[in-house]
Amino acid sequence: SGTTNTVAAYNLTWKSTNFKTILEWEPKPINQVYTVQISTKSGDWKSKCFYTADTECDLTDEIVKDVKQTYLARVFSYPAGHVESTGSTEEPPYENSPEFTPYLETNLGQPTIQSFEQVGTKVNVTVQDEWTLVRRNDTFLSLRDVFGKDLIYTLYYWKSSSSGKKTAKTNTNEFLIDVDKGENYCFSVQAVIPSRRTANRKSTDSPVECMGHEKGESRETGHHHHHH
């Protein structure tokens, strides 16, 4: 494979949220195209995104086969169109990515509050379980299925009339909290993997949801479901 006029990719970067995983790189191609290969440490190199003029490649299908494996990718550069033929048979230039372990490194997507319901002085807040592209026995798994008890949610809640926040934690997708009678509350949740010690330990906060807004009043004896 001749390599005339081709430059190796650089700045290979993994972008991954809830296991949706894209490899990005530079430069924008001029008279060249790319093919990406991905491998586990012990596995073989599998080509993806053949002869692409893009500078990104969706590798989700490969990494979801085993999210606890460590993956390495490499990007090959090939000349596109007419180039001066040197008769060279050297290997095409390529660049390796950093290693990537999806289970440890995928970012946690912004969670969503699925519903809340009040009964007396208790409110049950339910976090929507996000689906991932990870499969088991031909069934897509949720974020909770994949992470199990490694994943917790932190609930931030406060009276609509004040700014003092309280917090609660759960290793399921539900919170049951005590509230003051006759008060409206606002809620926001955050996904957290406490065992991680890196910047991707926490998700961004969910959108804020408040009792008594838009969808009707939440009565002490009634139910208020907030669906998205």
């Epitope: 494979s1 190199w45 599998k46 002869y51 003029a53």
Partner: antibody, heavy 121, light 107 residues
């Protein structure tokens, strides 16, 4: 139905050029790569290169670099393969072949009927 | 370039026989291998893609498997219409390359 129809047989002198066409129908032309594969008489198959019809980007096998040009005309859903500086060993059947879906991007799932190019003085 | 060594180059078998063709890659190509059937005077036809997936409309007597860099193509019960030359093709590395072909004849 999905099909690729190629231009007719050609006889060329050494040093000349030949341009073979391949008209696609029955599918969205821009969505599938097109490849060219040749087969010398009694011999095996040899991949020459690929063209992405949506952007016109081409990649050629090193063996053919500088002699082959692949182009496309999106208005007629046609791809072309031009081979220059012909020599006797270029005598072969030339096939266009569609690259498969994303599932099998570099499997050739639809083939043209082939164009016989004879190079003879 | 990746060399695809196909064997045997030809074989003769009876109708109903199990026929096996092998293709060995000169280096690891993952499962990026396809199998084609070419009848005399005709264009090749895709039978198997990604080493073991049967192309739509292809009879189930055709199958493919992989063990490391060795790939096997099998016709479980040879039929008269299976007389053809069979080719493997790898696409894991540029340029794409084919095996030399196996000509299958009926005894």
């Amino acid at each position: 139905q999905v099909q690729l129809v190629q231009s007719g047989a050609e006889v060329k002198k050494p040093g000349a050029s030949v341009k073979v066409s391949c008209k696609a129908s029955g599918y969205t032309f821009a969505n599938y790569y097109m490849h060219w594969v040749r087969q010398a008489p009694g011999q095996g198959l040899e991949w020459m290169g690929i063209i992405n019809p949506s952007g016109g980007i081409t990649v050629y096998a090193q063996k053919f670099q500088g002699r082959v040009t692949m182009t496309r005309d999106t208005s007629t859903s046609t791809v072309y393969m031009e081979l220059s500086s012909l020599r006797s060993e270029d005598t072969a059947v030339y096939y266009c072949a569609r690259g498969g879906s994303k599932v099998a991007a570099l499997a050739f799932d639809i083939w043209g009927q082939g164009t016989m190019v004879t190079v003879s003085s | 370039d990746i060399q695809m060594t196909q064997s045997p180059s030809s074989l003769s078998a009876s109708v109903g026989d199990r026929v096996t063709i092998t293709c060995q890659a000169s280096q690891d190509i993952s499962n990026s291998l396809n199998w084609y059937q070419q009848k005399p005077g005709k264009a090749p036809k895709l039978l198997i893609y990604d080493a073991s997936n049967l192309e739509t409309g292809v009879p189930s007597r055709f199958s493919g498997s992989r063990s490391g860099t060795d790939f096997t193509f099998t016709i479980s019960s040879l039929q008269p219409e299976d007389i053809a030359t069979y080719y493997c093709q790898q696409y894991n590395f540029h340029p794409l390359t084919f095996g030399g072909g196996t000509k299958v004849e009926i005894k």
